[in-house]
């Protein structure tokens, strides 16, 4: 059996390999070996056949015994070294160095700018029913429909600080007490985590970069659902959030102050408001119980207006309804009265691109997802594969060194906390832990960045994003001063609270085993990384939610007897793996259950089942798209799929052997060899290792 | 000019009805309330009703509830006022003043006045 | 229904003499108040609103004033044309109602 079991059957055909690649693989790029073109029989290669799904090498790639996947990879320099290029070769590498670097910084900027249209398209799709969950005040006072509202609402609009702006009017206004505002606040947390597990779903391409990446971005998940899971019963039972706070408010007499500075806005709002401009008080008076507001558009319309305060006549039902007095007549069949009435008025049209188009909110949010989602996975390819060909040699060194490096004994302890500060800090500065978070993904995922220094520099942004909404609630009018100051204190030590619990002790720190688990997991099956998110951020909270509105006897009725399952199996896991000795033989594994019960191996059969239905469908499509980019391009070296095809028609091109060429920017380990002589000199850019895995999902 | 120009003088039996028109021009009917008021020989002004021509609300006063009937034909400009049950006591001059809708001036031009006798 | 009161109900005054028509209300009606003219033979004509505007082409010589209750209109000099009856009509609440009129005659 091979070292990694998601290999086996790599193909729907086993007996079918990539010619030339039936021995075991070294992870070596083909680039690098000088071999001539023959395997390991002797024979010689004549062509490369890329299969549907699996047409990487890395899926036939097999892991030395010992080796940890975990490791971060080396990233060699495979170019010619500086020393020994001449005058020429010097200026040219500058100016590629020159020229990676602003593309890098564009790809960033485009990066940023399409999760903030991807945080709009989601207000636009989910946004009024985000804002229709909170205005069901009776739900909220249940701490754990509170939570999981929480979670919806901050998934729904993709930013936790349009939900703790709708919850400090809530609490501002009365219609939400603090104490019902912090399961809440412990949801949009929870939320919040999201967007960078989305990223993380991006670099599926790779099994080994999506370990990493996704296990990068659910450490976040974990931290937040562990935290919530110790601290909600602790809230519920003490209200040490609540009095906390209190004392803090007490004891300290804030002034308004200045808001955080936007300084990724600032960049980023010239290019993000020429696409869209939403009206975000229509979700909060939605959630203020405005049935108005139900009718409105989020997207606005209108960016410039004047306000004009007129004397008006007004009908009223009877003269005791009349604002003042000596103002109040009535024309024979109406009762009037004067009052002042503001009046907007509209001057100047917003400068986006949907401002003329009369498309309903849904209509738009579905392009702008779509569009967003394309240009995020774009940008993302392209930053791994700058990176990748940026962070090489010295360079990776240095910077693999810098971050991932403790401090000297004995104060090696203090490096997780200085990357605590730095998150801290970073996030202060761009303003969002989704795009702090979201940037590291691919970092942790090339493997830039290890998961431990991820976890501290994560529980950092954690922190940075409540300073920042400290910040703004200081800066908030003085009317909602205190609610805001309170809740955005009650998001600051539920954090605090959280690192204390799952930080300082190297055993505690729980969320990193999780993730890893999860990141070997999803990498075996990579559809259980979209099931994850499904599942935990849409599907149980629904439930939760719906459970919630059934009434309090019907979800603890529902709800202990799952949880006591699911402490009996972690009960029985936990003895399983400590002392198995004292178990019953039988008790010993989970061989007592069904296959389905213990195992993601027939559920992964279904999956593949349903997914090769599509496949046929979908290959031609692929085949065709290839095709025109590599004309487009006019790529050197391009194959595109043939797992459309009957068996007979690829037998037919095989004997024609009539290669498409593609361009480098692609690479492709599996590519043939005839490819892979070509630009021997040039600097390696970091495969991508098939774009055709992303079709996994 | 601002013109509200009534029918003619009417002689009727009691328990007859009797339908007066008030044309009007010179301004936007629609923006207008059109009342009608009487006043019976050497007595002051009653209001009976008014009518918002716009969307045809009508309100009467109470003694007159169930026995008038206000309508407004739009494309002529006219109002009509139907009196119904008629006694003895409606003998008078019946008048339509316009009053502009949600506006305090008060009824700021009258019609000439039709005179009603109810006489068997 | 709100009752309007009208004093005097009639006064004989001579030509340049200046004339004080008061008019009370059942209860407070604000400043919704307004002042007709009625000529003999002839339908009313509105002089004054809201207890103290002219309206328009009415002379200066009419001027009304009050609030709450009690309200008058005054003729600051009398003039040959101004032999009418003279009613005031709140206008606060409905049924709309008038006062019985003051007629104004010259000696």
């Known amino acids: 059996m091979a070292p990694w079991p998601e290999l086996e059957n790599a193909q729907p055909n086993p007996g079918k390999f990539i010619e030339g690649a039936s021995g075991p693989q070294s992870s070596i790029p083909a680039k690098d070996k000088e071999a001539s073109k023959t395997n390991d029989n002797g024979t010689p290669v004549a062509k490369t056949e890329l299969l549907p799904s699996y047409s990487a090498l890395v899926l036939i790639e097999e892991h030395p015994e010992g080796t940890d996947p975990w490791d971060l990879p080396e990233l060699q320099d495979t170019g010619i070294k500086w020393s020994e290029r001449d005058t020429k070769g010097k200026t040219l590498c500058i100016f590629q160095g020159v020229g990676k670097f602003i593309l890098l910084l564009g790809f960033l900027y485009l990066f940023v700018c399409s999760l903030d249209v991807l945080s709009s398209a989601f207000q636009l799709v989910g946004g009024k029913v985000a804002g229709q969950f909170f205005s069901n005040n009776s739900i909220m006072s249940n701490p754990v429909a509170g939570l999981v509202i929480g979670v919806l609402v901050t998934v729904m609009v993709q930013s936790s600080s349009t939900s703790s702006s709708i919850i400090v009017s809530m609490v501002a206004s009365s219609l939400l007490t603090v104490r019902a505002a912090i399961p809440i606040i412990m949801g949009a947390n929870i939320g919040t985590s999201i967007t960078n597990t989305i990223v993380a779903l991006m670099q599926a391409g790779d099994r080994n970069e999506f370990r990493r990446a996704f296990a990068g971005a659910t450490v976040h998940d974990f931290f937040n659902w562990l935290s919530v899971f110790v601290l909600l019963p602790l809230e519920a039972a003490t209200h040490y959030l609540e009095i906390l706070t209190n004392l803090v408010l007490e004891t300290f007499k804030f002034q308004n102050g200045e808001d955080a500075p936007d300084i990724l806005k600032v960049i980023t709002d010239p290019f993000t408001k020429l696409i869209i401009q939403l009206d975000k008080k229509v979700i909060q008076q939605i959630a203020m119980g405005d049935s108005a507001a139900q009718n409105k558009s989020l997207i606005k319309i209108w960016c410039k207006s004047i306000t004009n305060v007129t004397e008006m006549n007004v009908t009223v039902p009877s003269t005791d309804n009349c604002t003042s007095p000596s103002y109040c007549w009535t024309d024979g069949i109406q009762t009037w009265t004067i009052q002042n009435v503001t009046q907007k008025e509209n001057i100047a049209k917003c400068q986006h691109i949907f401002v003329n188009f009369s498309l309903p909110d849904l209509a738009v949010g579905i392009i702008l997802l779509t569009v967003s989602l394309v240009v995020l996975c774009g940008c993302l390819i392209m930053i791994v594969k700058l990176l990748g060909s940026v962070l090489r040699g010295q360079v990776a060194t240095v910077i693999k060194k810098t971050l991932n490096t403790d401090f000297p004994f004995p104060f090696a302890w203090l490096t997780g906390y200085l990357a605590i500060l730095v998150g801290a800090g970073m996030t202060f500065i761009v303003q969002s832990s989704s795009v702090f978070t979201s940037a590291m993904t691919p970092l942790i995922g090339i493997g830039v960045i290890s998961i431990e220094r991820a976890y501290p520099l994560t529980l950092g942004s954690n922190i940075g994003t409540t300073t920042t909404a400290i910040l703004a609630a200081l800066a908030s009018p003085g009317n909602t001063l205190r609610s805001s100051l309170q809740i955005a204190l009650c998001h600051f030590f539920f954090n605090i609270s959280g690192i204390l619990l799952w930080y300082p002790i190297p055993f505690t720190r729980l969320p990193i085993r999780l993730a890893k688990g999860l990141g070997n997991i999803s990498a075996k099956y990579r559809w259980f990384a979209v099931f994850y998110l499904i599942f935990f951020f849409f599907v149980t909270p629904l439930t939760v939610f719906g459970l919630s509105l059934a009434g309090w006897p019907v979800l603890v009725g529902v709800g202990v007897p799952i949880i006591l399952l699911l402490l009996l199996v972690l009960c029985l896991r936990m003895l399983q793996f400590r002392c198995p000795r004292i178990l019953p033989l039988k008790l010993r594994d989970w061989n007592f259950l069904p296959l389905w019960m213990h195992s993601l191996k027939p559920w992964d059969n279904v999956i593949s089942l349903a997914t090769t239905c599509f496949q046929r469908r979908c290959c031609c499509c692929c085949r065709v798209c290839c095709r025109v980019c590599c004309m487009v391009c006019g790529c050197k070296c391009c194959r595109c799929s043939k797992c459309c095809r009957d068996q007979g028609e690829e037998e037919e091109e095989k004997e024609q052997d009539i290669p498409v060429k593609a361009s480098g920017a692609f690479d492709n380990a599996a590519m043939s060899k005839e490819c892979q002589d070509e630009g021997k000199g040039q600097v390696e850019v970091l495969s991508m290792k098939a774009l055709s895995n992303t079709t996994v999902f | 000019q601002v013109q509200l120009v009534q029918s003619g003088a009417e002689v009727k039996k009691p328990g007859s009805s009797v339908k007066v028109s008030c044309k009007t021009s010179?301004?936007?009917?629609?923006?207008?309330?059109i009342h009608w008021v009487r006043q019976a020989p050497g007595q002051g002004l009653e209001w009976i009703g008014g009518?918002?021509?716009?969307?045809?609300?009508?309100n009467y006063k109470q003694n007159f509830r169930g026995r008038v009937t206000l309508t407004a034909d739009k494309s002529t400009s006219t109002a009509y006022m139907e009196l119904s049950s008629l006694r003895s006591e409606d003998t008078a001059v019946y008048y339509c003043?316009?009053?502009?809708?949600?506006?305090?001036?008060?009824?700021?031009?009258w019609g000439q006045g039709t005179t009603v006798t109810v006489s068997s | 229904d709100i009752q309007v009161t009208q004093s005097p109900s009639s006064l004989s005054t001579s030509v340049g003499d200046r004339v004080t028509i008061t008019c009370t209300a059942s209860?407070?009606?604000?400043?919704?108040v307004a002042w007709y003219q009625q000529k003999p033979g002839k339908s009313p004509k509105l002089l004054i609103y809201?207890?103290?505007t002219r309206h328009t082409g009415v002379p200066e010589r009419f001027t009304g004033s009050g609030s709450g209750t009690d309200f008058t209109l005054t003729i600051s000099s009398v003039q040959p044309e101004d032999v009418a009856t003279y009613f005031c009509?709140?206008?606060?609440?409905?049924?709309?109602?008038f006062g019985v009129g003051t007629k104004v005659e010259i000696k």
């Open positions: 010179g301004f936007f009917f629609t923006e207008y309330i």
């Open positions: 009509q709140q206008y606060r609440t409905s049924p709309l109602t």
């Open positions: 009518i918002i021509p716009n969307n045809d609300v009508t």
């Open positions: 003043a316009r009053w502009r809708n949600a506006y305090y001036s008060a009824m700021d031009s």
């Open positions: 209860q407070d009606v604000g400043t919704a």
């Open positions: 809201w207890a103290s």
